[in-house]
Interface confidence: low
Amino acid sequence: IFPLAFFIYVPMNEQIVIGRLDEDIILPSSFERGSEVVIHWKYQDSYKVHSYYKGSDHLESQDPRYANRTSLFYNEIQNGNASLFFRRVSLLDEGIYTCYVGTAIQVITNKVVLKVGVFLTPVMKYEKRNTNSFLICSVLSVYPRPIITWKMDNTPISENNMEETGSLDSFSINSPLNITGSNSSYECTIENSLLKQTWTGRWTMKDGLHKMQSEHVSLSCQPVNDYFSPNQDFKVTWSRMKSGTFSVLAYYLSSSQNTIINESRFSWNKELINQSDFSMNLMDLNLSDSGEYLCNISSDEYTLLTIHTVHVEPSQETASHN
């Protein structure tokens, strides 16, 4: 479009942009303001992403995968801003984008490397498989491959099984740990190095409680201050394990300060909840209440699991009636 004799060629600048799957990002590019601006964004130097000249977009030859996903900051072009607004990035968008900007006096080439990360909130689950107990740290969708570390009583464990499956866009990771017969506390950390995002799961086993029929039991559940931040949204769930599966007794959502109780004999102290103490009471115990009780406090950055084992024994009266 311009006579090349007038061009000053400016060496390529390179920047790295890290985006999150399905979020919008900006690929930056600036130039020294000038008249008759031409902007071409290309991917891997071959696919046309966005073209602008003579004061408007020219998207006739735009690659179909970018349709309705790109735009420039039109009011700022005259100020030297050729940045590209890019909607809903996917892992397939990763790669090198080159922005060529021409004005009446020079051509500038800017390179932007786009890396895309995925980190759907992980979970820590407690499972019984036959006679074995397992803690499983898992993340449904993560990219690139995360760093998973386990600690037992704050000491790193080198054994680290990782079950990995790939889907079109990311990895799905399970890291199981056999904790059969252990009373230790466990911690699992999953780190996405690209997004600089870390999630921690912590599991604590409380001493077993022996109670008589028709008594009540108080089960403690207080978050560890290292992880817990009350101004962050979180959810607390109390559940009971019966024959290998958990049934939810009650849950609390911090965002709405809502408590939902599914078991009439379950009670929560509102005042304690306001002090971030999620201990619960179960009234009028019967023999079928024996089992494992799990308190799960979860947010985007952590899961804290506390497990109690309750043994309910027949009262003397019941025993003598039989």
């Epitope: 790295i16 696919y47 397939l92 990219y143």
Partner: antibody, heavy 116, light 107 residues
Framework: QVQLQQSAAELARPGASVKMSCKAS????????MHWVKQRPGQGLEWIGY????????DYSQKFQGKSTLTTDKSSNTAYIQLTSLTSEDSAVYFC?????????WGQGTTLTVSS | DIVMTQSHKFMSTSVGDRVSITCKAS??????VAWYQQKPGQSPKLLLY???TRHTGVPDRFTGSGSGTDYTLTISSVQAEDLALYHC?????????FGGGTKLEIK
């Protein structure tokens, strides 16, 4: 389990072209990029480039641009590298490797000898 | 392109020794460094990625450290089967580049 099976050794004349293959099994082929790496006898590793089988796009090291072409056949889970205008400098072992950023599984390598 | 330099082409060690192999990048690669082990006549095997994370099945005598431009692979107690060529690689930006390799020899 993940396996990358590469084609047999090749002997070629200078100026000729050669196409080597890498058949993947044990995982979803379109999920991971496939990289190609060159190793001359007693030397280090050189990254040639990669191809994304899902989209078919490829990215090459400048040194190998024009020398190599990467392709895939999704129906047979196979990746290919074609090398053209062969010279003795192209004599090497060529590896395919499954990518994320790091290369977690490698083929056994295909030895290319260019000789008149 | 980012240049990865392994300053020692050869390193000699004894079984049971601790050995550290170093790798220097020509620019900051943000811990995006992988280490590979290659035994004679075999293809490379991934040991570590993101500078310090062990790949599945890699013995815990192999550890990695580093940030910015300087990275180290350490074998805490060398075994006879560790005799191999060790490559570092940056997986920060394409073109991905490898170091020249360090050959670990057993005395």
């Amino acid at each position: 389990q993940v396996q990358l099976q590469q084609s047999a050794a090749e002997l070629a004349r200078p100026g000729a072209s050669v196409k080597m293959s890498c058949k993947a099994s044990g995982y979803t082929f379109t999920t991971y990029t496939m990289h190609w790496v060159k190793q001359r006898p007693g030397q280090g590793l050189e990254w040639i480039g990669y191809i994304n089988p899902s989209r078919g796009y490829s990215d090459y090291s400048q040194k190998f641009q024009g020398k190599s072409t990467l392709t895939t056949d999704k129906s047979s889970n196979t990746a290919y590298i074609q090398l053209t205008s062969l010279t003795s400098e192209d004599s090497a072992v060529y590896f395919c490797a499954r990518g994320g950023y790091d290369f977690d599984y490698w083929g056994q390598g295909t030895t290319l000898t260019v000789s008149s | 392109d980012i240049v990865m330099t392994q300053s020692h082409k050869f390193m000699s060690t004894s079984v049971g020794d601790r050995v550290s192999i170093t790798c220097k990048a020509s620019q900051d690669v943000g811990t995006a460094v992988a280490w590979y082990q290659q035994k004679p006549g075999q293809s490379p095997k991934l040991l570590l990625y993101w500078a310090s994370t062990r790949h599945t099945g890699v013995p815990d005598r192999f550890t990695g450290s580093g940030s910015g431009t300087d990275y180290t692979l350490t074998i805490s107690s060398v075994q006879a089967e560790d005799l191999a060529l060790y490559h570092c690689q940056q997986h920060f930006i394409t073109p991905y580049t490898f170091g020249g390799g360090t050959k670990l020899e057993i005395k």
